[in-house]
Amino acid sequence: MAFSGSQAPYLSPAVPFSGTIQGGLQDGLQITVNGTVLSSSGTRFAVNFQTGFSGNDIAFHFNPRFEDGGYVVCNTRQNGSWGPEERKTHMPFQKGMPFDLCFLVQSSDFKVMVNGILFVQYFHRVPFHRVDTISVNGSVQLSYISFQNPRTVPVQPAFSTVPFSQPVCFPPRPRGRRQKPPGVWPANPAPITQTVIHTVQSAPGQMFSTPAIPPMMYPHPAYPMPFITTILGGLYPSKSILLSGTVLPSAQRFHINLCSGNHIAFHLNPRFDENAVVRNTQIDNSWGSEERSLPRKMPFVRGQSFSVWILCEAHCLKVAVDGQHLFEYYHRLRNLPTINRLEVGGDIQLTHVQT
């Protein structure tokens, strides 16, 4: 199985929503659906993993219902016909409340975690490789849908390349053999992370392109600052880290640090007071030489949202901002697995972190 990188998230998509899962489902793929159950209208919502956009072939239909005390229905639809329902009589969702819903695809089943607790496992009734689309409908408002790929080593060449600054727009994938889309970063020597413009189907017959990271603010989730989290397993070639957030209107500076013990292996420091993006490494409290060159103007703007994508390769880190390659930073600390802590601080509000 080839590593296909982590797909860019869908942010604040309108409901009903249908979006492509690039490369289809793979063993180990994790999909997070974050949103809020609407308190007013409707008594149901559903997340569907399906083939195409028609809704006739749904490998996994996850359907919370606020009826009869609350329960969740899981099912499969083949050629328009539903199979037998599997019901879980505990309702982990609450009307009017936010939720964090996470799906893990494994060889035998889907595992579903709700708000940090394993909720249900649903054994595959049809081959999951057929799934190429996720859809969400019903009484729910979405903050984002994000994707995190398994940590795997490529066994075949990764995707073809395109210029760094050129995101790619794909139409809905036709049924049958899937075409692998090109990526933003080149394939050699490590697997890539794709950053693309998603084509989203908001409702039947309405097709429109939306940037992978549109400039939007989110009421939640709000991360406390400074934000510190462990990077499980540390860095390794093909590892990617995604952050999105909003720069505060009066921002002076913020930083994203990748740390190894007391050392800062990579310090990414946008400075609005200097109109610069400074990169550096700190070893034993001593800073090295700064790197400041940029291929274009300062990509971070006060008061606007942003995404930062950090891809670790064998010799360097590649950094993309808002889906566009910005710079490479050659490793100064080369023991990558020990770089296992992410620290974010300064004048931003974080809305999403994926490590």
Epitope: N34, D100, N115, I231
Partner: antibody, heavy 123, light 109 residues
Framework: EVQLVESGGGLVQPGGSLRLSCAAS????????IHWVRQAPGKGLEWVAY????????SYADSVKGRFTISADTSKNTAYLQMNSLRAEDTAVYYC????????????????WGQGTLVTVSS | DIQMTQSPSSLSASVGDRVTITCRAS??????VAWYQQKPGKAPKLLIY???SLYSGVPSRFSGSRSGTDFTLTISSLQPEDFATYYC???????????FGQGTKVEIK
């Protein structure tokens, strides 16, 4: 370094209240689920409650439902357990523990625990 | 509630012995099971997470396995520092999302 430190335990009369605190360092409580687990003298471990600040959700053991409230202040990186209508059978050492972090949801286990704080309910 | 029935409640063993502790879940809990070691007056320590994964820093003599709803903690060669109480714990969403086994006290023979 990840650390959890509980405080707020003590002697309280039946029907009284206590508020336990669990101060976290080395990670953010908003990216984890925080659990309270108690252990009565000479007994086993009993799960009490958990909070998942990331989506403002919580859950309670049947034995404490309606009496205990779990909360978190992400600006202080601290979780709390407000215990009301305390009974003799609530006497225990109360531990807070970190469950899965947001970036490693599929790791099922409580990897860091506090040292515990003793709550004694007695007249 | 999902019950975790742990056995035995206590056992006596010698240094170098192979020790096996089992937990049976009252319904499927997937692999959402952890094992902990607790010594008197101390907080529990995570040994095994996700049924069979060894937590970092834990000696390799500890291992976990799963067969359906049966979960096993094995200590391949008991060491003096292993005399303690061991607990299994499941985390599968139910009326109580977390439950512990009753504990197994491993004593010196």
């Amino acid at each position: 370094e990840v650390q959890l430190v509980e405080s707020g335990g003590g002697l309280v009369q039946p029907g009284g209240s206590l508020r336990l605190s669990c101060a976290a360092s080395g990670f953010t409580v908003s990216s984890s689920s925080i659990h309270w687990v108690r252990q009565a003298p000479g007994k086993g471990l009993e799960w009490v409650a958990y909070i998942y600040p990331y989506s403002s959700s919580s859950s309670y053991a049947d034995s404490v439902k309606g009496r205990f409230t779990i909360s978190a202040d992400t600006s202080k990186n601290t979780a709390y357990l407000q215990m009301n209508s305390l009974r003799a059978e609530d006497t225990a050492v109360y531990y807070c523990a970190r469950y899965s972090t947001y970036s490693s949801k599929w790791v099922w286990g409580m990897d860091y625990w506090g040292q515990g704080t003793l709550v004694t309910v007695s007249s | 509630d999902i019950q975790m029935t742990q056995s035995p409640s206590s056992l006596s063993a010698s240094v170098g012995d192979r020790v096996t502790i089992t937990c049976r879940a009252s319904q499927s809990v997937s692999s959402a099971v952890a094992w902990y070691q607790q010594k008197p007056g101390k907080a529990p320590k995570l040994l095994i997470y996700s049924a069979s994964s060894l937590y970092s820093g834990v000696p390799s003599r500890f291992s976990g396995s799963r067969s359906g709803t049966d979960f096993t903690l094995t200590i391949s060669s008991l060491q003096p520092e292993d005399f303690a109480t061991y607990y299994c714990q499941q985390s599968y969403y139910d009326s109580n999302p977390i439950t512990f086994g009753q504990g197994t006290k491993v004593e010196i023979k």
